[in-house]
Interface confidence: low
Amino acid sequence: LPAQVAFTPYAPEPGSTCRLREYYDQTAQMCCSKCSPGQHAKVFCTKTSDTVCDSCEDSTYTQLWNWVPECLSCGSRCSSDQVETQACTREQNRICTCRPGWYCALSKQEGCRLCAPLRKCRPGFGVARPGTETSDVVCKPCAPGTFSNTTSSTDICRPHQICNVVAIPGNASMDAVCTSTSPTRSMAPGAVHLPQPVSTRSQHTQPTPEPSTAPSTSFLLPMGPSPPAEGSTGD
């Protein structure tokens, strides 16, 4: 004979647990129905009546099967440096992620609590490690023979052009200037751009970074004049 189907509320066998989407109500000492996502318990069960569920009100939600007396409040609206990647509905909280050019400096269970602008490497410094969703750009001084003349969160140090005759030698922040009109460098001129991080949970393919001398620490510091050795800007 098939096992008898028990309808909620029912008293569980000693030592057994309630079934999926049921909970044990300690007051009634019965297994009772949980409320579905998007609902909450309006009236708790008794020995003779099951849980009465009701829909969550506007701007509140429950994400799981539950028996909470009130739905949870959705988080506050996304700030100007964020984009709303998931709206507040009766079944899910609002999720805010950082907009392009920013990274998440303080995350929360889902989404981001505090976004900060990606560091920009100053002239003489290039990107050693690109920014991601959750980490800032790391800058490094351009090594001898390379330069960066931009303030950028994506540009890396590029090799100096090789001149037949050098008019002005290159340095960390300036390319060499040739007297000849035909430099021998085979690389195409112009800045090399790294891909901007996107605010989704995608895989980032990144070049292997060199050891960095510019740690990512300045996102909350007030922006005053800073020594050139730091190699980054806050704007």
Epitope: Y24, D25, Q26, C32, F44, L64, N66, W67, V68, P69
Partner: nanobody, 124 residues
Framework: QLRLVESGGGLVQPGGSLRLSCAAS????????MGWLRQAPGKEREGISC????????YNADSVEGRFTISRDNAKNTVYLEMASLQPEDTAVYYC?????????????????WGKGTLVTVSS
């Protein structure tokens, strides 16, 4: 398989302390409220402490407020109950239980998984 295993119970003198542990397996603590309940001989089971899975907020029954502290270590998938200033009326079998994501009060209001319990005896 979902399991909760309590440990740390035993005999303690009045005024003494104990730390109960509840090791969870088969699920991650992050997404559930966890609670401690107790049942004294000849009495109904009562909820005494709950910790929420959503934000870690805690709730205690009046009878243990200021003496018992519930905590969790998600990395170890374990819930703890620190019990201080124990009195003979705290003698009971202590059960660990799982609720949904949220607590509402010390009793969880219900539970869907619970352990077999650990006996705490307070006596001189």
């Amino acid at each position: 398989q979902l399991r909760l295993v309590e440990s740390g119970g035993g005999l303690v003198q009045p005024g003494g302390s104990l730390r109960l542990s509840c090791a969870a397996s088969g699920f991650s603590l992050d997404y559930y409220s966890m609670g401690w309940l107790r049942q004294a001989p000849g009495k109904e089971r009562e909820g005494i402490s709950c910790i929420s899975g959503s934000d870690g907020s805690t709730y205690n029954a009046d009878s243990v407020e200021g003496r018992f502290t519930i905590s969790r270590d998600n990395a170890k998938n374990t819930v703890y109950l620190e019990m201080a200033s124990l009195q003979p009326e705290d003698t009971a079998v202590y059960y660990c239980a799982r609720g949904t994501l949220y607590c509402f009060g010390p009793s969880l209001g219900g539970m869907d998984v619970w352990g077999k319990g650990t006996l705490v005896t307070v006596s001189s």
